[in-house]
């Protein structure tokens, strides 16, 4: 795979993953009512990081935000923090990677700078993905713990009214947001790894000769010394990028011979 393709694909995968992390963070269905004991409930409860909702058979849905910070479980606060950190890092990663993309030319930025930016964005995406995966996993663990605790209570807490009155304990299980979060975190992580791999292909090898552009007087053509197998694809900044009347063009428009860095 070429460096540009690897970098571009890594960027796209990270972007999709990042969008998924945002979607998961905003979704209300982090935990949904377990219907195993009451599959015919007319009232369905589900909860997100920011609010809890109730959907009735009538179609009426009511959501209430968690308007307190102090009263919320520390684990929920931690999950919120992890998801927000993941989003912030993802935003920074996207901004950095846009400037780092090989197919986009910005000013006189050389490839070593792009390589550093690609590596930076890759690391940011990796951390962002890890934050999301950890956040979702912590929440899932919290659900599993609460599920078994409420199951224990369900079978031990029936004696209060001499067994006459049953109290249905609402148990919660994994909601759609958890699966979205896991997949999104994984995609962001994979995208980040791809960006880091692409970075290796962008790093100039000092053992290679630098490409030098020679200009023949009176001709609008750049000559490259064929004996050197010149153009590494990184070239020196002395190359004239505007020798054709094409105006601003992407670097991929220029023909270059493949080198060991163009394939990973």
């Amino acid at each position: 795979m070429s460096v540009t393709a690897c970098q571009g694909l890594g960027f796209v995968v990270s972007l999709i993953g990042f969008a998924g992390i945002i979607a998961a963070t905003c979704m209300d269905q982090w935990s949904t009512q377990d219907l195993y004991n009451n599959p015919v409930t007319a009232v369905f409860n589900y909860q997100g990081l920011w609010r809890s909702c109730v959907r009735e058979s009538s179609g009426f849905t009511e959501c209430r935000g968690y308007f307190t910070l102090l009263g919320l479980p520390a684990m929920l606060q931690a999950v919120r923090a992890l998801m927000i950190v993941g989003i912030v890092l993802g935003v920074i990663g996207i901004l950095v990677s846009i400037f780092a993309l090989k197919c986009i030319r910005i000013g006189s930025m050389d490839d070593s700078a792009k390589a550093k930016m690609t590596l930076t964005s890759g690391i940011l995406f990796i951390i962002s993905g890890i934050c999301a995966i950890i956040g979702v996993s912590v929440f899932a663990n919290m659900l599993v713990t609460n599920f078994w605790m409420s199951t224990a209570n369900m079978y031990s807490g029936m004696g209060g009214m001499g067994g006459m009155v049953q109290t249905v304990q609402t148990r919660y299980t994994f909601g759609a947001a958890l699966f979205v979060g896991w997949v999104a975190g994984g995609l962001t992580l994979i995208g980040g790894v791809m960006m880091c791999i692409a970075c290796r292909g962008l790093t100039p090898d000092d053992s290679n000769f630098k490409a030098v552009s020679y200009h023949a007087s009176g001709q609008n053509v750049a000559y490259r010394p064929g004996g050197f197998k010149a153009s590494t694809g990184f070239g020196s900044n002395t190359r004239n990028k505007k020798i054709y009347d094409g105006g601003a063009r992407t670097e991929d428009d220029e023909q270059s011979h493949p080198t060991k860095y163009d394939y990973v």
Epitope: T41, N45, S58, G59, F60, V168
Partner: antibody, heavy 118, light 113 residues
Amino acid sequence: EVQLLESGGGLVQPGGSLRLSCAASGFTFSSYTMSWVRQAPGKGLEWVATIIIGGSYTYYADSVKGRFTISRDNSKNTLYLQMNSLRAEDTAVYYCTRLVKGNAMDYWGQGTLVTVSS
Amino acid sequence: DIVMTQSPDSLAVSLGERVTMNCKSSQSLLNSGNQKNYLSWYQQKPGQPPKLLFYWASTRESGVPDRFSGSGSGTDFTLTISSVQAEDVAVYYCQNDYSYPFTFGQGTKLEIK
């Protein structure tokens, strides 16, 4: 003005079939969950069946499960109750109702009488 | 299934008197998600279809006189008429709106002495 008008009731022999209809008007029918409730002569109310907004979920009382089918046609603003294998104990006034907040039934039709007798 | 039990079966009161009727469910009707009780009250006058009075146990339906009030939580609920009027003669039903099958109480018949 919200109106629910039941029709299709009548005298039927045990084991026979009947299809009740409920024509709804004055509200967006497709946006509401609908139910059938019945009342045997001189007795209390008994919930029969419910169909959720999209029509994808239906719920039935144990006494009618497998014999009755609730359905809806949102394009015609009509609710149906197909009653098969009718028994004497199915004799009742059948009401069509609309569900609102709290799963409560805020509007009821005038009812249609179904008599199962030989 | 949730069993709804109403008491008394019938009661006769004088005009202007305060009346209370009860409804008990075999399971709690309190939903932990929104802390609301899924119980409704209906009034059925002779020869008429039932009329919704309360949903969520205590939320009065529009058009219902404020002499009617609903209260209770969990498994025990009450319908109170602060000053009975002649037009209140009816059978009153409570209903479980929490889980299927929706079940009604057997009804409480209110009469005037």
